[in-house]
């Protein structure tokens, strides 16, 4: 190989050992029989050399640095050449570095030809191995603007006082052009301006200078986004930190077309604007930091550009002004991530503050719109708390657990509407009375409705799930001892049509000791399946539940258990079941940890089934499934 550098090129070539590998045999640069491991060639010099091994690319790297002085004379503006040409260099991983020094008052602009650049974060790498590292200068301090790959949106980077651009090419890469040019501009009066051009839909992730380290103190950095007028842009902050400011405030400023309040100033913790039409600028402004404990300012954000959807021009009013202790969250439903570009799906408050999820709270009227290609990608979760603090005031009071019509009119599917029902401990209990009798969801008879009620304890320490219940069954009411959550969960878009079937009333009733009581009024000719709470995990220790089963005068109820034995093994206490005729008070007691479960039994009158658990050994839980079937008395049952 021969490298001869023109005298006035201001180029230095450095060949040095790269990252050490576990290769057994060392490799050397050979010059006139001398073996060396580092070679520096400066302007005007000529060196002829070879390598002592077959694959020098596994051992050595080459750096080509060109110093461009714009201080003492005119700057060589225009397209930047790869000099020396890559064809003249040994096939090593190579880094071309251009170090441009200019006066503080001179603006320098790097212009990138297509493909434009895509910024990458720490730990990321470029698929083709070609990286562009760009840094600027503040007095003597080097500031990293960022590391970039090809195939992105960044078209221009403007800086002041100097710029250092490093282009890293893997040894096998055929690239023989720099892909950028340098132009002079008037002073930009800030650290840098990054221009990002969107031709169509797409996204760009960008970072503050020095990311993930701190943004330079009291500096200003601007991103200019060029967006076709027919598309919409939304900004979301992926990661940020604030420093400790002594004077001024760290903020972002937007220049948004058509806005009457330019610049729009936001705190970094605010929701950022969305649904913006056309070009806009975003600036990050630092502050004077506390000398003792400066902290760091850093920002990583994403700009998503996509077509406006039909929904984006519709405003929906969600009136929660008459609600109390309620929050509504619209968020993306979980999906498998695809590798191709997926347009963003945003919900916007007042048409401008858009984000992938939005929580609305009670006490206000909210105006929302959507910026989303497919609203089925979103769903709604609502939480409402109904609490009673004074038992004298609440007793016998009733509340309707119904989804407000405002929410049902939104174009987004309701996933969960949860009511947290709170009562004063040991003073009151709760009763749930459905508008339509409920069916308990079991494997034997699953619910096939568009929604269900999930009833569970709302006491943090208690793991008690009563079950999933849907309209169209035999459960007339559910009484529970203490705090519960009732969640209306929808399973199909047809819920909108079936919404009239929802309706549950909760009343506060005198306190009782049992964990739950189910009142069951079976219908003729239908088999009612019932199962103990916490199915699959076992009824909690020392918990007692009852079923009050009504048998009409002209009917006989057949009670059938679906196992021979309960399977429970008690560590302490006893597990038992009581079946009691309500008219005669006659009862049968079964030891669930010892006895065989009863064979099918016939009941001519209403009866109770009470199941009480012991403290079971782990893995030997109490799960019981039973059914009740009514048949007319005239049938001979012998």
């Amino acid at each position: 190989f021969e490298i001869a550098l023109p005298r006035e090129s201001n180029i230095t070539v450095l060949i040095k050992l790269g990252t050490p590998t576990l290769l057994a045999k060392p490799c050397y640069i050979v010059i006139s029989k001398r073996h060396i491991t580092m070679l520096s060639i400066k302007s005007g010099e000529r060196i002829v050399f070879t390598f002592s091994c077959q694959s020098p690319e596994n051992h050595f790297v080459i750096e080509i640095q060109k110093n461009i002085d714009c201080m003492s004379g005119p700057c060589p503006f225009g397209e930047v050449q790869l000099q020396p040409s890559t064809s003249l260099l040994p096939t090593l991983n190579r880094t071309f570095i251009w170090d441009v020094k200019a006066h503080k008052s001179i603006g320098l602009e790097l212009q990138f030809s297509i493909p434009r650049l895509r910024q990458i974060g720490p730990g990321e790498s470029c698929p083709d191995g070609v990286t562009h590292s760009i840094s600027g200068r503040i007095d003597a301090t080097v500031v990293r603007i960022g590391t970039f790959c090809s195939n992105g949106t960044v078209s221009r980077i403007k800086m002041q006082e100097g710029v250092k651009m490093a282009l890293h090419l893997p040894w096998f890469h055929p690239r023989n052009v720099s892909g950028f040019s340098i132009a002079n501009r008037s002073s930009i009066k800030r650290l840098c301006i990054i221009e990002s051009v969107f031709e169509g839909e797409g996204s760009a992730t960008l970072m503050s200078a020095n990311y993930p380290e701190g943004f330079p103190e009291d500096e200003l950095m601007t991103w200019q986004f060029v967006v076709p007028a027919h598309l919409r842009a939304s900004v979301s902050f992926l990661n940020f930190n604030l420093s400790n400011c002594e004077r001024k405030e760290e903020r972002v400023e937007y220049y948004i077309p058509g806005s009457t309040t330019n610049p729009e100033v936001f705190k970094l913790e605010d929701k950022q604007p969305g649904n913006m039409a056309g070009n806009f600028n975003l600036s990050l402004q630092g502050c004077d930091q506390d000398a003792q404990s400066p902290g760091i300012l850093r920002l990583q954000f994403q700009v998503l550009v996509q077509h406006p959807q039909n929904e984006s021009n519709k405003i929906y009013v969600v009136d929660l002004s008459n609600e109390r202790a309620m929050s509504l969250t619209i968020e993306p439903r979980p999906v498998k991530q695809s590798r191709k570009f997926v347009p963003g799906c945003f919900v916007c408050l007042e048409s401008r503050t858009c984000s992938s999820n939005l929580t609305l709270t009670s006490g206000s009227k909210h105006k929302i719109s959507f910026l989303c290609d497919d609203l089925t990608r979103l769903w709604m979760n609502v939480e409402k708390t109904i609490s009673c603090t004074d038992h004298r005031y609440c007793q016998r009071k009733s509340y309707s657990l119904q989804v407000p019509s405002d929410i049902l009119h939104l174009p987004v599917e309701l996933h969960d509407f949860s009511w947290k029902l709170l009562v004063p401990k040991d003073r009151l209990s709760l009763v749930l009375v459905p508008a339509q009798k409920l069916q308990q969801h079991t494997h034997e008879k699953p619910c096939n409705t568009s929604f269900s009620y999930l009833v569970a304890s709302a006491i943090p320490s208690q793991d008690l799930y009563f079950g999933s219940f849907c309209p169209g069954g035999s459960i007339k009411q559910i009484q529970v001892k203490q705090n519960i959550s009732v969640t209306l969960r929808t399973f199909a878009p047809s819920f909108q049509q079936e919404a009239s079937r929802q309706g549950l009333t909760v009343s506060f009733i005198p306190y009782f000791k049992e964990e739950g009581v189910f009142t069951v009024t079976p219908d003729t000719k239908s088999k009612v399946y019932l199962r103990t709470p916490n199915w699959d995990r076992g009824l909690p220790s020392l918990t007692s539940v009852s079923w009050n089963i009504s048998v009409p005068r002209d009917q006989v109820a057949c009670l059938t258990f679906f196992k021979e034995r309960s399977g429970v093994v008690c560590q302490t206490g006893r597990a038992f079941m009581i079946i009691q005729e309500q008219r005669t008070r006659a009862e049968e007691i079964f030891s669930l940890d010892e006895d065989v479960l009863p064979k099918p039994s016939f009941h001519h009158h209403s009866f109770w089934v009470n199941i009480s658990n012991c403290s079971p050994t782990s893995g030997k839980q109490l799960d019981l499934l039973f059914s009740v079937t009514l048949t007319p008395r005239t049938v001979d049952l012998t």
Epitope: A4, I31, S32, R34, I36
Partner: antibody, heavy 120, light 112 residues
């Protein structure tokens, strides 16, 4: 045997032009950098210009920049020096020299020289 | 540009006696390769210059071993262990590190 033979020297008036040639033989001309070195009467040696193997890179001493042009024709195994705007101080014997194929700018072979006299 | 300074200007010698010529450069000629990019040339009367020493201390082919080069950085020496009559002429040092290539003023070696 390596041979370099210069020609084209002579008497020329100040401001005039002259084209020197160097015919190379006995080696692969296209594989070597080539230079012109001059020596004013009774004075020392002064490097003038050089040209890369393929003619893509050229360098000159400051005193001749913009007036002299070095070139080569590898097909003809020839090196040239086009001298314009000649001055009295350009009077010298002009040697054609081969740069050795080693590191640095070492001349391993020289021609016998051709005299250029600039005088009115 | 690198300036080369040679001394003495003239060196009268007795055949069979040693001779020494000094050359100094305005900046170091020691390269990162470990070589000193300095050459010595001899121009015999009425002839073209010929290469004697390259890279500071390496003799060119066909050069008698009575010629040797030494030195590093900015100070270099050419020694002739026993001068012979055919060694007369002007000796030039040249920095071969970077363009523009520059020569010393020359040292004229003549027989006493």
């Amino acid at each position: 045997e390596v041979q370099l033979v210069e020609s084209g020297g002579g008497l020329v008036q100040p401001g005039g032009s002259l084209r020197l040639s160097c015919a190379a033989s006995g080696f692969t001309f296209s594989s070597y950098w080539m230079s012109w070195v001059r020596q004013a009467p009774g004075k020392g040696l002064e490097w003038v210009a050089n040209v890369k193997q393929d003619g893509s890179e050229k360098d000159y001493v400051d005193s001749v920049k913009g007036r002299f042009t070095i070139s080569r024709d590898n097909a003809k195994n020839s090196l040239y020096l086009q001298m314009n705007s000649l001055r009295a101080e350009d009077t010298a014997v002009y040697y054609c020299a081969r740069e050795w194929n080693s590191s640095g700018w070492t001349f391993d072979y020289w021609g016998q020289g051709t005299l250029v006299t600039v005088s009115s | 540009d690198i300036v080369m300074t040679q001394s003495p200007l003239s060196l009268p010698v007795t055949p069979g006696e040693p001779a020494s010529i000094s050359c100094r450069s305005s900046q170091s000629l020691l390269h990162s390769t470990g070589y000193n990019f300095l050459d010595w040339y001899l121009q015999k009367p009425g002839q073209s210059p010929q290469l004697l020493i390259f890279l500071g201390s390496n003799r060119a082919s066909g050069v008698p071993d009575r010629f040797s080069g030494s030195g590093s950085g900015t100070d270099f020496t050419l020694k002739i262990s026993r001068v012979e009559a055919e060694d007369v002429g002007i000796y030039y040092c040249m920095q071969a590190l970077q363009t523009p290539l520059t020569f010393g003023g020359g040292t004229k070696v003549e027989i006493k």
